[in-house]
């Protein structure tokens, strides 16, 4: 039975040209995390594999930085980065958990972050 839950940064916003940390946290389970995939729609951003480490998609290699932890830092933001992001936790023996983050990239200088995992 899958007992775990994923906490995410929820809905967040950031300024164009800036950077943002996408962060998820899996709790309430003792399952082993074997891999975390970060995706935007069906597009791969990056993978953090427990044995092999990080792999960044070619499309994002110049502006995605691994971490902190299992999170992902997205840099040089453009308005085209607005949209849904998913952290997909592959675990054993539970299976797959998915968290969702909505990022809005703003033109203005006022960009407020979501309530959880606030980025200074």
């Amino acid at each position: 039975m899958m007992t775990g839950t994923i906490e995410t940064t929820g809905n967040i916003s950031a300024e164009k040209g800036g950077s943002i940390i996408l962060q998820c946290h899996l709790s309430s389970t003792t399952a082993q995390v074997t891999q975390v995939n970060w995706e935007q729609q069906d597009q791969l951003l990056a993978i953090c594999n427990a044995d092999l480490g990080w792999h960044i998609s070619p499309s994002f290699k110049d502006r995605v930085a691994p971490g902190p932890g299992l999170g992902l830092t997205l840099q040089s933001l453009t308005v085209n980065d607005t949209g849904e992001y998913f952290c997909i936790y592959h675990t054993y023996p539970d299976g797959t958990y998915t968290g969702r983050i909505f990022l809005e990239v703003l033109e203005s200088s006022v960009a407020e972050h979501g309530a959880r995992f606030q980025i200074p």
Epitope: Q35, L44, L52, H55, P58, S59
Partner: antibody, heavy 120, light 107 residues
Framework: QVQLQQSGGELMKPGASVKISCKAT????????IEWVKQRPGHGLEWIGE????????YYNEKFKGRATFTADKSSNTAYMQLSSLTSEDSAVYYC?????????????WGQGTTLTVSS | AIQMTQTTSSLSASLGDRVTISCSAS??????LNWYQQKPDGTVKLLIY???SLHSGVPSRFSGSGSGTDYSLTISDLEPEDIATYYC?????????FGGGTKLEIK
């Protein structure tokens, strides 16, 4: 030494499905992506997509999404590509190749190719 | 998708010649380019990765260069075993795309 041994040529009818195999030897199967590439005469090389055998994570060229399916069997170090709803446009040579996990974006070893002919 | 163009589809040269094969991208790809060799029997080998890095085991007569949208592969001293078709491959953005190939023949 590293080898990617592909299954033999196939003659299929339009509308059918085909499954091509790629057996890897001489390296740690889970540490590399398996890439699939199509070659039609006069059309050069076309990337179909990739699978990470350790986790089964797969990513597809939009053009092949929904018709190509990648799987991998870690026990036999074999990757598979299934192509469904075949048409004459699918007549081609299909290659598997490997790409190291991590930020190594080149296909350093290739299979010998599998010729698929679709004809009624 | 980024389009890769190899304007010369076939090229004829003599043994010992210096041969240059060109490839252009529809947009800047920041040196994210590889070169492959496909022999007449269909065998494919990696020659050059990241524009100019020679893959292990590849003879030093092969070299790569370029930047922005324009790239080239040079064979400094053509040998009989170099008879093949050569493909460029960009990995700046998915989907990966390849050039149409340049077939190299001996005069």
């Amino acid at each position: 030494q590293v080898q990617l041994q592909q299954s033999g040529g196939e003659l299929m009818k339009p509308g059918a499905s085909v499954k091509i195999s790629c057996k890897a030897t001489g390296y740690t199967f889970s540490n590399y992506w398996i890439e699939w590439v199509k070659q039609r005469p006069g059309h050069g090389l076309e990337w179909i997509g990739e699978i990470l055998p350790g986790s089964g994570s797969s990513y597809y060229n939009e053009k092949f999404k929904g018709r190509a399916t990648f799987t991998a069997d870690k026990s036999s170090n074999t990757a598979y590509m299934q192509l469904s709803s075949l048409t004459s446009e699918d007549s081609a040579v299909y290659y598997c190749a490997r790409q190291k996990y991590g930020n190594f974006y080149y296909f350093d070893f290739w299979g010998q190719g599998t010729t698929l002919t679709v004809s009624s | 998708a980024i389009q890769m163009t190899q304007t010369t589809s076939s090229l004829s040269a003599s043994l010992g010649d210096r041969v240059t094969i060109s490839c252009s991208a529809s947009q800047g790809i920041g040196n994210y380019l590889n070169w492959y060799q496909q022999k007449p029997d269909g065998t494919v080998k990696l020659l050059i990765y990241y524009t100019s890095s020679l893959h292990s085991g590849v003879p030093s007569r092969f070299s790569g260069s370029g930047s922005g949208t324009d790239y080239s592969l040079t064979i400094s001293d053509l040998e009989p075993e170099d008879i093949a078709t050569y493909y460029c491959h960009q990995y700046s953005k998915l989907p990966y795309t390849f050039g149409g190939g340049t077939k190299l023949e001996i005069k």
